[in-house]
Interface confidence: low
């Protein structure tokens, strides 16, 4: 072997955002003269998992036949080429929806607006939540999240439009999760349709750039962020 | 505080089934995981299955799978296993835990357990 | 399926005395995934150590717990009459999720 093992690259099928009860597949592609894989999970002693190499030997395969809480977290592979590792690969975030209940996204004065009116977005949990995020579809991110300072538990969390335009209409949905596990994240709520009526005006920014946190005890930190695994949510509601 | 008030003891026929219940308090019950445990006398722990309230999800020891069906009612916060086509080899104590995620160590762990319910299987 | 295998099966300490039991995997479990409970006799079992080393809440610090991959080992750096009772470890890393057999610890 000259120089240094190439790095693998990691990725998962069908995809890194799984539901519950889903099956997931992590992939760890290296070279043609690997002899062994292994997986690691953060917070783990390494190797979480070692397979056997499939032919012609330049992957391996790992099984989760069905989606828990056990499974989520971030992960790397490397692998071994006699005699020599190879470096670990990028990480990879799986998350797990369905971990809580789905919340409750509601429009407020009402999902159909006129032009210029002020708008709110309100996601309600059923049980206490501290991180709330906001999705809007065809969206390439997350809108901002909201997340409770110190920790404090809500049952809700207030998305503020402001006074919207006809960019600001499309279909939403809300997601809540808790801080101490980014990885765990409830169901999605159900859609909710904005309709913004008559447009008078020129249009304002995009609602990425113009919905801003709640005034009181809440605090918005934008998404993504490269080492946040819910950045790049978009798929896999289900 | 947590409680999990598993319902009293059952003399059973054999091939018979029984239906134990598990009432949860004191916690968000579709949150955690509620697994299943036997206990044959004198004997160490077996893991029966659990069973995800949030989405009725199940996961089973391949050894209880036609033996044991969990179920849950988010209603009221009770998850129920029946143990069918019972011989004496299913009389014991089993318990329901619930599992709660210590995402720090990346774990979930049987924190909380009921009482216990005995089944005896006699004719 | 993991078979976990735990020694002694039976033993008794003094009061005050340092006491250590093992519990050994048939294959590789990651330490997140290995737990132990304490049962005494005509009560459920209760969470006592998990993911190897951690402390369940209200447990003495007297407790300890250690090892990876197929051997780990609960410690009680001085035995109190309390700590009589059976400890059992247990796995998930794979299914089925198995329990050893069991060390029953009495006071000599």
């Known amino acids: 072997q000259a120089g240094p093992l190439p790095k693998p690259t990691v990725w998962a099928e069908p995809g890194s955002v799984i539901s519950w009860g889903s099956p997931v597949t992590i992939w760890c592609q290296g070279t043609l003269d690997a002899q062994e894989y292994h997986l690691d999970k953060e917070g783990s002693p390494a190797p979480w998992d070692t397979q056997n190499p499939l032919e012609p030997r330049n992957k391996a395969k790992f099984s989760i036949p069905s989606m828990t809480q056990h499974y989520a977290g971030r992960y790397r592979c490397y692998y071994h080429s006699h005699p020599d590792w190879s470096e670990d690969s990028d990480p990879l975030d799986l998350v797990m929806t369905g971990a809580y209940s789905k919340p409750i996204l509601s429009v407020l004065p009402s999902p159909l607006v006129t032009s210029g009116e002020s708008v709110t977005l309100l996601c309600q949990s059923q049980s206490p939540m501290d991180t709330f995020l906001l999705f809007k579809e065809g969206a390439a991110h997350p809108l901002p999240r909201l997340r409770s300072q110190h920790g404090a538990q809500l049952h809700w969390a207030e998305f503020p439009m402001g006074p919207v335009t006809s960019v600001h209409g499309g279909t939403y949905r809300c997601i809540s999760s808790r801080s101490f596990s980014h990885y765990l994240l409830s169901r999605p709520s159900d859609p909710v349709e904005l309709t913004v009526l008559g447009s008078l005006e020129s249009p304002s920014p995009s609602p990425t750039r113009s919905i801003s946190a709640a005034a009181g005890p809440e605090d918005q930190s934008l998404m993504p962020t490269g080492s946040d695994p819910q950045s790049g949510l978009r798929r896999h509601w289900e | 505080e947590v409680q999990l008030q598993q319902s009293g003891p059952e003399l059973v026929k054999p091939g018979a089934s029984v239906k134990i219940s598990c009432k949860a308090s004191?916690?968000?019950?579709?949150?955690?995981?509620m697994d299943w445990v036997k206990q044959s006398h004198g004997k160490s722990l077996e893991w029966i299955g659990y069973?995800?309230?949030?989405?009725?999800?199940?996961g089973y020891n391949q050894k209880f799978n036609s033996k044991a069906t969990l179920t849950v009612d988010k209603s009221s916060s009770t998850a129920y296993m029946e143990l069918h086509s019972l011989t004496s080899e299913d009389s014991a104590v089993y318990y329901c835990?619930?599992?709660?995620?210590?995402?720090?160590?990346?774990?979930?762990?049987?924190?909380?357990w009921g009482q216990g319910t005995s089944v005896t299987v006699s004719s | 399926q993991i078979v976990l295998t735990q020694s002694p099966a039976i033993m008794s300490a003094s009061l005050g005395e340092r006491v250590t039991m093992t519990c050994t995997a048939s294959?590789?479990?990651?330490?997140?995934?290995l737990h132990w409970y304490q049962q005494k006799p005509g009560s459920s079992p209760k969470l006592w150590i998990y993911?190897?080393?951690n402390l369940a809440s209200g447990v003495p610090a007297r407790f300890s717990g250690s090892g990876s991959g197929t051997s780990y080992s609960l410690t009680i750096s001085s035995m109190e009459a309390e700590d009589a009772a059976t400890y059992y470890c247990?796995?998930?890393?794979?299914?089925?999720?198995?329990f050893g057999g069991g060390t029953k610890l009495e006071i000599k």
């Open positions: 993911s190897t080393s």
């Open positions: 835990a619930s599992s709660p995620y210590y995402d720090y160590v990346g774990s979930y762990a049987m924190d909380y």
């Open positions: 294959s590789s479990v990651s330490s997140s995934y």
């Open positions: 247990h796995q998930y890393h794979r299914s089925p999720r198995t």
């Open positions: 004191g916690y968000t019950f579709t949150d955690y995981n």
């Open positions: 069973i995800y309230p949030n989405n009725g999800g199940t």
